[in-house]
């Protein structure tokens, strides 16, 4: 049994890091493998992650972590029974994928203005809380070409757009994702999308 693609890990910089790797053949990850991880820190304890299958030869493990900070560094040991298959390390702050924003809501009752709001996925005491920026994707269910991205570079998790910038009388969907420049993160996954019917009063032509 050998590792074909070494584990690569990403952290949500809060409580979970996800590691994925591939074996050289079909593997029952949960029964045959264990990923041991330990913070390189005084008094830290070793933890064991039981991997799940991710395709025939692929495995994925969700590592639970406490109080993630930039100085943290973890040792990783991948075991098959008594055999050490791979040894490595992982610094969560250098491989951050933020959590997806939640509770995306479209408020359509503000005089011909659409107000989109969502929730910051981090608590205020997490460093990323004040450092997320967002991308909002709006698209038409009827017209695949009607697809737009709004970059929200301020901290407030909201976006106002004129209803008239979208077509009237048709349904739209929106979703939002986040990233943080400070840790050079990847983009989060998209939030679940929300749907609304866009309608507004056309101004009278004189």
């Amino acid at each position: 049994m050998k590792v074909l693609q070494e584990p690569t890990c990403v952290s949500d910089y809060m409580s979970i890091s996800t590691c994925e790797w591939k074996m050289n053949g079909p593997t029952n990850c949960s029964t045959e493998l264990r990923l041991l991880y330990q913070l390189v820190f005084l008094l830290s304890e070793a933890h064991t992650c039981i991997p799940e299958n991710n395709g025939g030869a692929g495995c994925v493990c969700h590592l639970l972590m406490d109080d993630v900070v930039s100085a943290d560094n973890y040792t990783l040991d991948l075991w098959a029974g008594q055999q050490l298959l791979w040894k490595g390390s992982f610094k969560p702050s250098e491989h951050v994928k933020p959590r997806a924003p939640g509770n995306l809501t479209v408020h359509t009752n503000v005089s011909d203005t659409l107000l989109l709001t969502w929730s910051n996925p981090y608590p205020p005491d997490n460093y990323l809380y004040n450092h997320l920026t967002y991308a909002v994707n709006i698209w038409s269910e009827n017209d695949p070409a009607d697809f737009r991205i709004y970059n929200v570079t301020y901290l407030e998790p909201s976006l106002r757009i004129a209803a008239s910038t979208l077509k009237s009388g048709i349904s739209y969907r929106a979703r939002v994702r986040a990233w943080a420049q400070c840790y050079n993160t990847t983009w989060s996954e998209w939030s679940p999308s929300t749907k609304w019917h866009n309608s507004y009063r056309e101004p009278f032509e004189q």
Epitope: L43, E45, D66, D67, V69, S70, A71
Partner: antibody, heavy 116, light 111 residues
Framework: QVQLVQSGAEVKKPGASVKVSCKAS????????MHWARQAPGQGLEWMGI????????SYAQKFQGRVSMTRDTSTSTVYMELSSLRSEDTAVYYC?????????WGKGTLVTVSS | QSVLTQPPSVSAAPGQKVTISCSGG????????VSWYQQLPGTAPKLLIY???KRPSGIPDRFSGSKSGTTATLAITGLQTGDEADYYC????????????FGTGTKLTVL
């Protein structure tokens, strides 16, 4: 919000021991290390040691080795710092502080006076 | 005796800028991150800066930190009378044993 509530002031005689408590609330108790530091009157801060509330293991500054003990009670989310063989130079305010590499939140402090 | 040296006192007028240095060595500041704590008279210390230059939520951006080599610096702009306090730097050492030294402390007076 995070709160670290420390026990009240103590007056002790030289040679005695003192046990200071720090009750934590507002966060997952076992997820954060706890430090202890002290400050003698008019002096600076001095680090004493650190405890991992999950397993209960602790490590102490060399200066206090053999004289200090840090423990925890997960059922009450409380950490304790016991200092023995007290001398007058141990008169200080003793602080618990939550954190790992740095101390995010501090208790208000417990004044321990050692006097004959 | 602390291995991190700070000036005993600094002073400046309201609205001015002041800097406080924290000098260490390769085994502490040079190899770790620095944090800064503010201790108002009669109160417990409060975290101002961690990770050399990051501010916890609620700390105004008038406070900033930096590090170069074995020296860290805390800068406070737009000084206010409420900033009058003792300031301590801190770091950690992992050479033979792990320890968390604090700086000697600096008394800031707002004139």
């Amino acid at each position: 919000q995070v709160q670290l509530v420390q026990s009240g002031a103590e007056v002790k005689k030289p040679g005695a021991s003192v046990k200071v408590s720090c009750k934590a609330s507002g966060y997952a108790f076992t997820s954060y290390y706890m430090h202890w530091a002290r400050q003698a009157p008019g002096q600076g801060l001095e680090w004493m040691g650190i405890i991992n509330p999950r397993g209960g293991s602790a490590s102490y500054a060399q200066k206090f080795q053999g004289r200090v003990s840090m423990t925890r009670d997960t059922s009450t989310s409380t950490v304790y710092m016991e200092l023995s063989s007290l001398r007058s130079e141990d008169t200080a305010v003793y602080y618990c502080a939550r954190g790992k590499y740095w101390m995010y939140d501090w208790g208000k402090g417990t004044l321990v006076t050692v006097s004959s | 005796q602390s291995v991190l040296t700070q000036p005993p006192s600094v002073s400046a007028a309201p609205g001015q800028k002041v800097t406080i240095s924290c000098s260490g060595g390769s085994s502490n500041i040079g190899n770790s991150y620095v944090s800064w704590y503010q201790q108002l008279p009669g109160t417990a210390p409060k975290l101002l800066i961690y990770d050399n230059n990051k501010r916890p939520s609620g700390i105004p951006d008038r406070f900033s930190g930096s590090k170069s080599g074995t020296t860290a610096t805390l800068a406070i702009t737009g000084l206010q009378t409420g900033d009058e306090a003792d300031y301590y730097c801190g770091t950690w050492v992992t050479s033979t044993v792990w320890e968390w030294p604090f700086g000697t402390g600096t008394k800031l007076t707002v004139l």
